[in-house]
Structure formats: C-alpha cells, structure tokens
Amino acid sequence: ATKLTEEKYELKEGQTLDVKCDYTLEKFASSQKAWQIIRDGEMPKTLACTERPSKNSHPVQVGRIILEDYHDHGLLRVRMVNLQVEDSGLYQCVIYQPPKEPHMLFDRIRLVVTKGFSGTPGSNENSTQNVYKIPPTTTKALCPLYTSPRTVTQAPPKSTADVSTPDSEINLTNVTDIIRVPVFN
C-alpha cells in the first residue's frame, strides 16, 4: 500500500487555503475531481466536486470552497475562503474513476485554523497580490456516490449542494449535501 503523507497548513481565521493538486493530464484531464474531508473513524466525505465531465478552468463554488480544474496544466486548484477555526481537519483531493476506487492526488492536507488577526486577508500567501476577487459563480455540484465491496452501501444524497456567493455564511461542518466516498491506496 502507498504510504499516505500529510502536509500541514497553519492559517488564521479569515485567510484562504489555496492548494494545487497535480495530476497526469493525459489520463485525468476530463475526469471528475473532488475535495474531501476525512474525519477520525469515518469514510472521507465529499465537500465539493467538479462537473462531469470536468470543465476546463470553470470554477465551481460550494459554500466557501472553490474548485478550478485546469485541464491544460493537469492541475486542480482548491480554495477554501474565509477560513473558520472549525474548518480545521484532514482533507484530500481525489479523482473519481468508476468503477474503480477514487484516486487520491497530492498529499493529504492537515489544515489547522487558529483565531487571530490575519495580516493578509483572503490569502495564505505572502502579500504579493494586488487583485483577488472571488467570482460569484452559480454552478450546482452533483457529486457521485461510489461504494466499495469493502464498505457499507450508502443511500444517495437528498439533493445537490447549491453554490453560493462569497457573502454566504456556510459552515463546512453544517453542509448536509455531502457524500461519503471510500478512498483506498
């Protein structure tokens, strides 16, 4: 089995997590991709996913999560904006490849969000930017449900998660339209 490694990101409330997940573009360019949270003792839960097939560079926003899949570059960009302490946890990028198990990209992300004034609001990077606007996308994200012979079959989600503008106050911990997706490496 592949050794799962973690990359720690320590950010303050209000900042933005900005993760670049690389993939082999010839293989996975149009595959559907997802951002998942992994809670202790639970299967990974999908918080947001790209469309199927994934659209090149087209942003998909679910609450405070923005996914951008750059087919030309083999890169999935994941941003979680306006971070809250309760967003702390373990996350991962995956590629859906039915009927096989989802394929994990990149290292898992150990996000630690602490209280305190953020000197660079809207970003976890150095203040090298002069423009940072979050587009008000209105895409609906329908994430598939996959099961594995090694996991319990689960019921499909009640509905799709509506996309909201950056002004929306949606806590990731309160998102109900999430899907459990098993990931094995």
């Epitope: 990359e7 690389d22 030309d72 570059h73 290292d107 976890n124 990077e125 002069n130 940072y132 979050i134």
Partner: antibody, heavy 116, light 107 residues
Framework: EVQLVESGGGLVQPGGSLRLSCAAS????????MSWVRQAPGKGLDWVAS????????YYVDAVKGRFTISRDNAKNSLHLQMNSLRAEDTAVYYC?????????WGQGTLVTVSS | EIVMTQSPATLSVSPGERATLSCRAS??????LAWYQQKPGQAPRLLIY???IRATGIPARFSGSGSGTEFTLTISSLQSEDFAVYYC?????????FGGGTKVEIK
C-alpha cells in the same frame, strides 16, 4: 501548436518605461493563466508576474511591485507587461509563458536592456 | 519567500551514464515542484511537474522524485541532447521561486 511571441523589448534609460506584448495562439488563451518570467544575462530564471484568465487575481514578485503592471486582452489573445521606473537590475530576457504556477509553454523571449 | 537550492552547480557526466540532480526547498512545498531544461539560446522547457509527473512528450529517461523539501531529477542514460541547464521551481506559494540551476556538461 502553442505559440507565444514577445515584442516590445529594447534599450531604455534608467527611470524609463517599456511595454512588452505577447501574441498567443494555438490554445484557448482565455482559459489559461499567463505569466512573465525573466532571465538576466548569464543568470537563472526569475518569476515576475502572473494573471488569472479574467484578471481577478494578479500576483507580482516584490522587486517589481508598484513599477510593473501585467494585463491581458482575451479578445485579442494578448498579454502585456507595462514596465515603469526601470532599473539596471531589470535588464533581462523577458519570457511570456502559459500557466500561472508552473509553465508549460514559453515564448522565445524579448531582451530588455536598462542602461544609460 | 521559499528559497530553492540546487546542487551541484555543475555536473560532469559521460553520455550513457546516469545523472542525479538535487533540489532543496527552505520549507515544505509538498509536491508542488517542477523541473525545466534550458539549452543555450533557447527558452526553458517543462520536464516534470507535481514532483514526479512527466510533462507531455518528455522521454521516460527523465524522472522526478521527492516531496516536502528534498527533490531529485534523474536522467537514467544521458543522451547528447540532454546536456543543458536544469532548474527546479516551487509553486506552492507566491512568490514563485526557481533554484539557481544545475549545468549538466559532457565529461
């Protein structure tokens, strides 16, 4: 085939200005981040600036912040770099590149020489 | 700013031999690392991204490995066209930064 053709380089005095342009073809320009990377004579590579497809995000290296402005015209498939208050240390070949983080395609570059 | 350090500065290798180039980051860049090749008078060319994924059209003799702060580019059997300068670059954080380069020359 991806093509990136830079223009606008030349000799300029310290404190002067230049506007570099890049004509892009062979790919969907409006779907791609674009950047400028420079290379001083006999030296290594230095990232200068990056711009998102819709210009909603723009980033600069500290050394050029406040002096250089990256912009794009998606209707004309063109990328620009307005360089003001030029210094001797800005002397370099400037490459137009496709990508905002890592760089898949490069132009052949245009030489900017800042000297009195 | 993440500082990228490449070693050695110059590597003398005979054609057909293996070349191993190193790149170290001053802090973790996860797998957000790319390698480029530049020949005299030419623009750089992307070889590897995501630390280990070969870019389109890159021969299998080029391979990348590593994660976090330590990375390696290996050229399994050097061909005449491989003698060039190689740069690593991190793209985890702004500002994007390159290593100083390793020149691979004929021994």
């Amino acid at each position: 085939e991806v093509q990136l053709v830079e223009s606008g380089g030349g000799l300029v005095q310290p404190g002067g200005s230049l506007r570099l342009s890049c004509a892009a073809s062979g790919f969907t320009f409006s779907s791609n981040w674009m950047s400028w990377v420079r290379q001083a004579p006999g030296k290594g590579l230095d990232w200068v600036a990056s711009i998102k497809q819709d210009a909603s995000e723009i980033y600069y290296v500290d050394a050029v912040k406040g002096r250089f402005t990256i912009s794009r015209d998606n209707a004309k498939n063109s990328l620009h770099l307005q360089m003001n208050s030029l210094r001797a240390e800005d002397t370099a070949v400037y490459y137009c590149v496709r990508g905002g983080w890592r760089f898949e395609s490069w132009g052949q570059g245009t030489l900017v020489t800042v000297s009195s | 700013e993440i500082v990228m350090t490449q070693s050695p500065a110059t590597l003398s290798v005979s054609p057909g031999e293996r070349a191993t180039l190193s790149c170290r980051a001053s802090q973790s860049v996860s797998s957000n690392l790319a390698w480029y090749q530049q020949k005299p008078g030419q623009a750089p060319r992307l070889l590897i991204y995501g630390a280990s994924i070969r870019a389109t059209g890159i021969p299998a003799r080029f391979s990348g490995s590593g994660s976090g702060t330590e990375f390696t580019l290996t050229i399994s059997s050097l061909q005449s066209e491989d003698f060039a300068v190689y740069y690593c670059q991190q793209y985890k954080n702004w500002p994007l930064t390159f290593g100083g380069g390793t020149k691979v020359e004929i021994k």
